[in-house]
């Protein structure tokens, strides 16, 4: 290389990361195998769970404002879960990104898109509940499924906007041991006259902005909304929280627990630019907390089911019946189910966002299992515990 051929400029912390070499330690190899297995399982679970939630909530349930929020949360989690197999592959090939720069940018962007979308949607859910209790008349007149979808659309647009810097500054960097990193390179675009200053300011700006916009502000909105609702309900003499409140509380708690550590380490990483002593801690901790953040997308569908009353009891009692009904051949069912269709309301308040989804009263085959999870297969689609929790607009 000629003396004047400037190498790809990297921030000090990134260059030091590129110098870290892989160990051939046996115990570390076992940890790697376990990580691949765990992430592989999480990928599969996340895709299946969120796919089921999307299908059930979008196609098998009466559309309400609440189901609209859940639908969009599940969509965000499905996106994240869909990117998890590629992260698993990255781990499997020895922590090396072999899928190219463009896919590195896209993959990382999905992670951040999910981060922002989750935070924004949980804020919207909390504000929605707050409005229902604090401004019931206004909510009665303006709380429509169409309005909820419009709000979600705006929130998705904001999430995309906030993800742009992460797409722009994501890059593939070759490590000195031959592996490839898919990581921030804040000097990638217009590094400015002073690289050290650019590294410090941009890394800090990214860490602080994502902490505020995707974590602190949403949690502040959620806490404020919860406080406002609690105060109002205390005046009305209501004690027991409704089903939907329990569901939201569980999802918010999971969000805080899964994303909190990630933001802590992200802020530490920004500090590590000026304080190299923090770097080893960041390098060791970030992979774990990033995985924990990913797992939030896998945990949410489980929470939707577990926070609904009677679910486990119903599971134990009806498992045999369910298996029997699933294993019934299509020909034994007769054609009755396909000829009867549940009448859907034409109002904006209950219109399905997925026009292609028809709603048979008695789904067939595997769909019968999903139907049971949300209520009795033979009964009205609104009678299942998850359905009741999601359809509850006043609790």
């Amino acid at each position: 290389m000629s003396a004047n051929a400037t190498l790809k400029p990297l921030c000090p912390i990134l260059e030091q990361m590129s110098r870290l070499q892989s160990h051939s330690n046996t115990s570390i190899r076992y940890i790697d195998h376990a990580a691949v297995l765990l992430h592989g399982l999480a990928s599969l679970l996340g895709l299946v769970e969120n796919g089921v939630i999307l299908f059930v909530v979008g196609c098998r349930m009466r559309q309400t404002v609440v189901t609209t929020w859940v639908l969009h949360l599940a969509l965000s989690d499905l996106l994240a879960s869909a990117s998890l197999p590629f992260f698993t592959y990255f781990l499997a090939v020895g922590h090396s990104w072999e899928l190219g720069t463009t896919f590195c940018k896209l993959h990382s962007s999905i992670f951040f898109l999910n981060m922002f979308a989750s935070g924004f949607l949980l804020s919207a859910i909390s504000l929605d509940r707050c409005l229902q209790v604090v401004r019931p008349v206004w909510a009665q007149n303006h709380r429509t499924v169409a309005a909820a979808h419009k709000v979600c659309l705006v929130l998705w647009a904001l999430a995309v906007l906030n993800t742009v810097p992460y797409f722009v500054f994501r890059d593939t960097i070759s490590r000195l041991d031959g592996r490839i990193m898919c990581y921030y390179n804040v000097l990638l675009l217009n590094p400015g006259p002073d690289r050290d200053a650019t590294c410090n300011s941009r890394q800090a700006a990214l860490a602080v902005s994502k902490f505020l916009l995707a974590f602190l502000v949403p949690l502040a909105i959620i806490a404020s909304s919860h406080a406002a609702v609690s105060l109002r309900l205390q005046h009305r003499g209501r004690r027991r929280p409704g089903r939907f409140v329990r569901l939201v509380a569980a999802v918010v708690a999971a969000f805080a627990l899964c994303w909190g550590p990630y933001h802590v380490f992200s802020l530490l990483e920004a500090r590590a630019h000026a304080n190299p002593g923090l770097r080893p801690l960041v390098w060791r901790g970030l992979p774990f907390v990033t995985s924990l953040a990913f797992f939030n997308s896998v945990a949410n569908p489980v929470l939707y089911v577990l926070t609904c009353p009677d679910m486990l009891r119903k599971l134990r009692r009806s498992l045999r019946t369910v298996l029997e009904s699933v294993l019934v051949d299509d020909s034994e069912l007769g054609g009755a189910g396909s000829s009867r269709r549940r009448r859907t309301s034409s109002t904006a308040r209950s219109a399905s966002p997925l026009a292609l989804c028809s709603r048979p009263e008695e789904p067939r085959g595997p769909a019968r299992l999903l139907g049971w999870l949300l209520g009795s297969c033979a009964a009205s689609p609104q009678t299942g515990p998850l359905n009741r929790a999601l359809s509850s607009t006043s609790s």
């Epitope: 003396a3 260059e15 110098r19 870290l20 070499q21 002073d194 050290d196 200053a197 770097r279």
Partner: antibody
Framework: EVQLVESGGGLVQPGGSLRLSCAAS????????MSWVRQAPGKGLEWVAY????????DYPGTVEGRFTISRDNSKNTLYLQMNSLRAEDTAVYYC???????????WGQGTLVTVSS | DIQMTQSPSSLSASVGDRVTITCRAS??????LAWYQQKPGKAPKLVVY???QLADGVPSRFSGSGSGTDYTLTISSLQPEDFATYYC?????????FGQGTKVEIK
Amino acid sequence: EVQLVESGGGLVQPGGSLRLSCAASGFTFSSYSMSWVRQAPGKGLEWVAYISNGGSTTDYPGTVEGRFTISRDNSKNTLYLQMNSLRAEDTAVYYCARHRTNWDFDYWGQGTLVTVSS
Amino acid sequence: DIQMTQSPSSLSASVGDRVTITCRASENIYWNLAWYQQKPGKAPKLVVYAATQLADGVPSRFSGSGSGTDYTLTISSLQPEDFATYYCQHFWITPWTFGQGTKVEIK
């Protein structure tokens, strides 16, 4: 060809001041971080100052902090080291060195001798 | 401050010998280590950076290895032009300190 030429060395009394210069050529000076390294006669090497490519970040070891100031003029392709309150132990050959990336001195000047003596 | 301890401080060897110089840091420096060669009256020259990477124009008989706190510079077959003083330097946390040097002399 990369060239770093130091100047400004000489004999100075204890407590005195001196300003060293390093003229750079053969590369885009403003793209590289720079450092000063010294070597006392018959002794080892000691890093004494660092400056980022744009000049916003500087760093020094405790032995010279508060006495030495590193600066640069990218328009003149020149690096400077202002040395105040000089002591006998500051006697050394002072080298300016270019950082390969953020670290690793890939090019060095030939050095300039600073003698602090009464 | 991180202390860098080089050993041996001097060694005598013949042309064609395999020479190994070690450098020990007082704490983990995560491969942020460089090796320099200095001949009398001359400026130091970068030989190895990032503990294992050969600098441009350096013959392949030189190699760097190590991790954590222990690093090694090896010259597989010593040549007449290799007789010089070798210094290690860490670039982990400032101040970036050098080892005291290893003088490789002709036996």
